[in-house]
Amino acid sequence: AMDLILINSLPLVSDAETSLTCIASGWRPHEPITIGRDFEALMNQHQDPLEVTQDVTREWAKKVVWKREKASKINGAYFCEGRVRGEAIRIRTMKMRQQASFLPATLTMTVDKGDNVNISFKKVLIKEEDAVIYKNGSFIHSVPRHEVPDILEVHLPHAQPQDAGVYSARYIGGNLFTSAFTRLIVRRCEAQKWGPECNHLCTACMNNGVCHEDTGECICPPGFMGRTCEKACELHTFGRTCKERCSGQEGCKSYVFCLPDPYGCSCATGWKGLQCNEACHPGFYGPDCKLRCSCNNGEMCDRFQGCLCSPGWQGLQCEREGIQRMTPKIVDLPDHIEVNSGKFNPICKASGWPLPTNEEMTLVKPDGTVLHPKDFNHTDHFSVAIFTIHRILPPDSGVWVCSVNTVAGMVEKPFNISVKVLPKPLNAPNVIDTGHNFAVINISSEPYFGDGPIKSKKLLYKPVNHYEAWQHIQVTNEIVTLNYLEPRTEYELCVQLVRRGEGGEGHPGPVRRFTTASIGLPPPRGLNLLPKSQTTLNLTWQPIFPSSEDDFYVEVERRSVQKSDQQNIKVPGNLTSVLLNNLHPREQYVVRARVNTKAQGEWSEDLTAWTLSDILPPQPENIKISNITHSSAVISWTILDGYSISSITIRYKVQGKNEDQHVDVKIKNATITQYQLKGLEPETAYQVDIFAENNIGSSNPAFSHELVTLPESQAPADLGGGKMLL
């Protein structure tokens, strides 16, 4: 069902901002909620279209906000409409000027058919004019200027449904802008009656809930919920399930709530006044503060929830104690159950006191067949009857009824069962790519025969000639990759679709057969690539011992990093190396290899090497001297790639000493980029040179670096900036 709520904030328009918010709580509308002017109620109101926006704070809510400067265009009647499954629910409300000559006693007034009704307007402005009263925009009554009372009333001694409508009051010289509005709602039935013939007795709707004349259900005021509106919501919440929350600082203050007829409009529990901005007086609670607490045993009265009963006591006045008979209640039974064809075990669960017995619970099929429980159990609070239908089929779809009949009363809960056909793909899956150990499958799950929606999909597969069970993988995408397949093997594939609910696995769809590729051998082991000369690289590997008799060879692919130059070389399988020649000096090459038979093998990882240099190496760069102490210093540098640098030499001597008195430190690992000189003299200036060596020779230092050690007691100095790690 639809839980539609219209919040009118504020119905009396002054110069402040005012709004209408329509909330569809707890349902998903197929069509959008609409807010519009109610021309049925007031024909001659403003014609401007409303600027309806999405309420950003709620998923299913629309809003109309009028800024203060639009005050003149607001007066009138409005509606909010929600539609679901073709059924429309419309809620009506009004807005009027706070400075109107008259103000209504209430925004709406709900009465029963046949009630004695007084519709009253309070005079707030005294004028020397006749007062006039209109119904739905048509004149019905006037009061001469000298007889206009403080409370202007329309008397209906025996209210009928045709008396319902929007009543407005103003002075004759006024207009829509100065009119006051109130809406009379007349229930189609007499008090406490409902039904097409009004011959059903209403459930006692508590807390000012209103009995709906068509359904007999209670429409609960904002702040109460349940079948009889006895249950108070948590503070500042509203809606049929109390899931909506008033976001104002003072909760639902200044919110006028309008619910579907015949409820009309009221404040939320705890508030009263036309603007719902007045708190209830002590001892009163509920919507418009119309309910008196009268709590037994001195229990507290809360203006929002009523009497706050101590444990063991219940009722509106906390007047009941102990366990009492409770009408059975069917619980946990959804209105609509979707069932997959096959075995079905419906459950009826009921509470009540005394608890229903096995014999008191039945299930009636759409064709009238009465089923008795196949299994029955109960807890302290519930009786559970389990029925068995061995094979439920689509023709069994329809309204089923769970029926419970005990000494405490009878309850029937109809619920709709929709029996679904299990889904089955119409097409076999397609193999869109395959190799020797993998296959990429388009599972082709659509179109399918039967009913959706599809909850999950399984891809079943197995080798054709093996007596193996089907393996399966759960798939989420239409494209799935099967790995770890056997080479040169024929596989069968099919797809099983699973729809929601128990027993939702459909029959597997058509089978696809495919064959994986003949296998290629693994790449050679122990691959090593080293420069041999300026124009050759040497690739070596461990001897290959193939498992089959097939002829094989090693395919080597080399390509230059710098140039678009690629070559593939075939090497007989009995060899363990190949010299890659006709290369360019000082160039980087990427090499990979594989072992081929009739089928191509798997490529190895890429190996990278530079051919030897044809020029002297460049000087090391970014030379820094740091962490200088009285006897040591750290030297760091960087070298350029690609010059076949094999070692770095650091040459240092005390300044002023002979050239032959230098010390050479040769670092044979070119990946090392820093070195600590030790054993230096304190307070001594040193001349430091650093150069790189490759196959051609040494680099030429452009200038020397000076290093002066510290006195013995001093802290380390840093001549080269950055922090250096050893």
Partner: antibody, heavy 117, light 108 residues
């Protein structure tokens, strides 16, 4: 609509190289295995090479192994065939074809490669 | 490698008549066989896959049958546009994926 358009065919001398391209559109190129199939003038069809969707697996017929390299650029939805050391017997119309269940469900119109001295 | 032999090399048939083409595999290929049609100056077109399934958009006058090593393609009533070369292809054991030598269907 699935479309495959080959290009790069030319007249070359024996021993020379050539690169063919196949531009694909209308489908998720990167998940399909792709193939080159050739047809010598007046002759039948011959499968040449195949590459997996991610480029990780390649296959060649014996007649081109070691001389031809199949590759793909999924970002450009393009398939390539690098043909080195071309011979007179490589003269053919080269078709690019999409794999489905190891047969070929879509073909390009072909590009002619002539190897002649 | 699996060798496919198609026969006859050329088949002369009148429009409206039935044509049956044969394809024999040197080894078992299960049902992994496809048929293609190629008209002069055009690319091949897939007709039948998995030995007997018609590809999308192929008229029902084309039908395939067979399994294992012996396969046939039948054109129930030849239309003028059906005169072309027909190739079979196996995809059971690969690489290589192999084609038959083709059968030319010409107007009698």
């Amino acid at each position: 609509d699935v479309q495959l358009v080959e290009s790069g065919g030319a007249v070359v001398r024996p021993g020379e190289s050539l690169r063919l391209s196949c531009a694909a559109s209308g489908f998720s190129f990167d998940i399909y295995g792709m193939n080159w199939v050739r047809q010598a003038p007046g002759k039948g069809l011959e499968w040449v090479s195949r590459i997996s969707g991610n480029g990780g697996s390649t296959f060649y017929s014996e007649s081109v192994k070691g001389r031809f390299t199949i590759s793909r650029d999924n970002s450009k939805s393009t398939l390539y065939l690098q043909m080195n050391s071309l011979r007179a017997e490589d003269t053919a119309i080269y078709y690019c074809a999409r794999t489905l269940n190891n047969f070929f469900d879509y073909w390009g119109l072909g590009t002619l490669v002539t190897v002649s001295s | 490698e699996i060798v496919l032999t198609q026969s006859p090399g050329t088949l002369s048939v009148s429009p409206g008549e039935r044509a049956t083409l044969s394809c024999r595999a040197s080894q078992h290929v299960g049902g992994n066989l496809a048929w293609y049609q190629q008209k002069p100056g055009q690319a091949p077109r897939l007709l039948i896959y998995d030995a007997s399934n018609r590809a999308t958009g192929i008229p029902d006058r084309f039908s395939g049958s067979g399994s294992g090593t012996d396969f046939s393609l039948t054109i129930s009533r030849l239309e003028p546009e059906d005169f072309a070369v027909y190739y079979c292809q196996q995809y059971y054991d690969w690489p290589p994926l192999t084609f038959g030598g083709g059968t030319k269907v010409e107007i009698k």
